[in-house]
């Protein structure tokens, strides 16, 4: 089995306050199977962005097409960003389970917020 | 609520070709994945073909390849069936299906009979 | 090939299990389909292994571990008689499968 790596090419990504941002996260691997989700920020208060298995996530929008059957692309649109999005965005791959449980996660996206031009 | 609703079985000569239609409401169908089931006379569920949110992949099973072909218009929350030479062996009843984001079905249509004979 | 056994029977108010072998942990999520009479639309009872539909009764439940899943009722009611596919979908072949049906009796 190929291991699966979990790719956020983006370090960093900078947007102004009521644009969109788009934060990247490719998959290697559709194995083993189960969600993805993103999350603003890590440990006990972390905020779930998007999760796979469940929704609607109204300001959140998938990049590609995730109904896809062989997708390994879960980037993500945000709209309408303000400065409480500011933070640091992981993709995480959830293994299937009950509950499902996180077995990899991205090395994660920071978001920062600019001023919206006048 | 979601309503799934097939058309266009029948009685159609072994050769010949036939055309299913299912009409989605209830739902955001532009924003799901669709499938094929068929049910022979006596027998058990067989998944024939499905076809990804935006239309552009589609999957089928070996047997059906090549003769059947999966498509769908978002414009009309419709989804279709083109079957081409047909044998008796197609005779059964056919239903769409709607898929869960892991590619499993959560709704049914009634279903349609097409019966092959001479 | 999904295997199920072919019939069950039970009396109302026992639990039932009814399992389903042959997919693989890793690459294969399970659902369950109820069909009351032959050619009538199927309902999903189970979906993902585990998850009930909103509109279905809760003592319907399903797991899955290793390379099988099962589905319980709980206080099965004659109501539930009715045949019960398993289903899955591999990741590997992007392919769904069923396994023959399980009839459930209820005495």
């Known amino acids: 089995e190929e291991e699966l790596q979990i790719i956020q090419p983006d370090k960093s990504v900078s947007v102004a306050a009521g644009e969109s941002a788009i934060l990247h996260c490719t998959i290697t691997s559709l194995f083993p199977v189960g969600p993805i989700q993103w999350f603003r920020g890590a440990g006990p208060a972390r905020v779930l962005i998007y999760n796979q298995r469940q929704g609607p996530f109204p300001r959140v929008t998938t990049v590609s097409e995730t109904t896809k059957r062989e997708n390994m692309d879960f980037s993500i649109s945000i709209s309408n960003i303000t400065p409480a999005d500011a933070g640091t965005y992981y993709c995480i791959k959830f293994r299937k389970g009950s509950p499902d449980t996180e077995f990899k996660s991205g090395a994660g996206t920071e978001l920062s917020v600019r001023a919206k031009p006048s | 609520d979601v309503q799934l609703v097939e058309s266009g079985g029948g009685v159609v000569r072994p050769g010949e070709s036939l055309r299913l239609s299912c009409a989605a409401s209830g739902f955001t169908f532009s924003s799901h994945a669709m499938s094929w089931v068929r049910q022979a006379p006596g027998k058990g569920l067989e998944w024939l073909a499905g076809?990804?949110?935006?239309?552009?992949?589609?999957y089928y099973i070996d047997s059906v390849k090549g003769r059947f072909t999966i498509s769908r218009d978002n414009s009309k929350s419709s989804l279709y069936l083109r079957m081409n030479s047909l044998t008796a062996e197609d005779t059964a009843v056919y239903y769409c299906a709607r898929e869960t984001w892991n590619h499993l079905f959560d709704y049914w249509g009634l279903g349609t009979l097409v019966t092959v004979s001479s | 090939a999904l295997t199920q056994p072919a019939s069950v029977s039970a009396n109302p108010g026992e639990t039932v299990k009814i399992t389903c072998s042959g997919g693989?942990?890793?690459?294969?999520?399970y659902a369950w389909y109820q069909q009351k009479s032959p050619g009538s639309a199927p309902v999903t009872v189970i979906h993902s292994d585990d998850e009930r539909p909103s509109d279905i009764p809760s003592r319907f439940s399903g797991s899955a571990s290793g390379s099988a899943a099962t589905l319980i009722i709980t206080g099965v009611r004659v109501e539930d008689e009715a045949v019960y596919f398993c289903?899955?979908?591999?990741?590997?072949?992007?392919?769904?499968?069923f396994g023959a049906g399980t009839t459930l009796t209820v005495l």
């Open positions: 693989d942990y890793y690459s294969t999520y």
């Open positions: 289903g899955g979908y591999d990741g590997r072949t992007y392919i769904n499968t």
């Open positions: 076809i990804s949110a935006g239309g552009s992949d589609t």
